[in-house]
Amino acid sequence: PGPPPGPPRVSPDPRAELDSTVLLTRSLLADTRQLAAQLRDKFPADGDHNLDSLPTLAMSAGALGALQLPGVLTRLRADLLSYLRHVQWLRRAGGSSLKTLEPELGTLQARLDRLLRRLQLLMSRLALPQPPPDPPAPPLAPPSSAWGGIRAAHAILGGLHLTLDWAVRGLLLLKTRL
């Protein structure tokens, strides 16, 4: 065995990485909030909108105390992956009315992808279990009408907002345990 190829540079400590993941999640939460408000201004929501294919909210704020690091990161990754696929679907099949949300929707998609990469890197650095995401659900059918696309957008952005809000709280709590 030979010598290592020069002194390695120190990559971010996983605790510092958790900090930057929290910042990225907060920034994504602000983007989502802003985009949801933009959508409400253009197409006011008539009540709550649901989409059966979206993940159920991971955890109530009250249950956060019992969380374990692997469980949070695994669940968060799976849920965000689902939202990423829904945002991609929305951009592809949402119809002309939703084109008014570009380029913000594209930026949201890119940041969501970046957050997913960051979470996976954190799990790798900590050597936590990385179960595969749930098998992809059948492809989402295009909305039946322009209003169907708008209702789906309300549901996706609303659900993503709640998930990211939960994620920030969960990650901050986990930081104290690392």
Partner: antibody
Framework: EVQLLESGGGLVQPGGSLRLSCAAS????????MHWVRQAPGKGLEWVAV????????YYADSVKGRFTISRDNSKNTLYLQMNSLRAEDTAVYYC???????WGQGTLVTVSS | QSVLTQPPSASGTPGQRVTISCSGS?????????VHWYQQLPGTAPKLLIY???ERPSGVPDRFSGSKSGTSASLAISGLRSEDEADYYC???????????FGGGTKLTVL
Amino acid sequence: EVQLLESGGGLVQPGGSLRLSCAASGFTFSSYGMHWVRQAPGKGLEWVAVISYDGSYKYYADSVKGRFTISRDNSKNTLYLQMNSLRAEDTAVYYCAAGVPDYWGQGTLVTVSS
Amino acid sequence: QSVLTQPPSASGTPGQRVTISCSGSSSNIGSDYDVHWYQQLPGTAPKLLIYSNNERPSGVPDRFSGSKSGTSASLAISGLRSEDEADYYCAAWDSSLSGPVFGGGTKLTVL
């Protein structure tokens, strides 16, 4: 400067045992998952085992399951690999690696031969 | 037999661009797990070259870049130099093995 220093390699007979150690410095050892990766002479890299940052999760390659045990002592910044029932095909340079792995030691040679 | 498949060898002349492929399956690269690339210079320990598909650790020149699509990934080296002559390995987490897997390695020769 990050340093991972393996020790404990050497010549051992088939069926014998060895314990490898890896002393870490220059980074927060207790915040990183740690791996053992080996490389047989003239061959590619083969992952052997991994242990989570706090020691609560351990995974092994099928080829070593039931024979090798990975462990760590965060108070001593040290990683271990206990190797039992050694076979000729376990002959390799054993690297200790941290994180993704981001950092690698220089390796220690284990030779299993009669 | 490695879980990730790489060509055993690749070559190029100085200044050229070379690409090394890494093919996986639905239990590793295709399962949304990130790909990492390592460079092993002769007689030395491996060194992390690319992580999370396309990120470079500090100190790695921007001549090195990575990409991923579906169940495969690739490493591109532009402006090839003689010091790039080394073995290159891809790696990714594999859910069926509950651990990382490596490609068989590609020996890059600079002609």
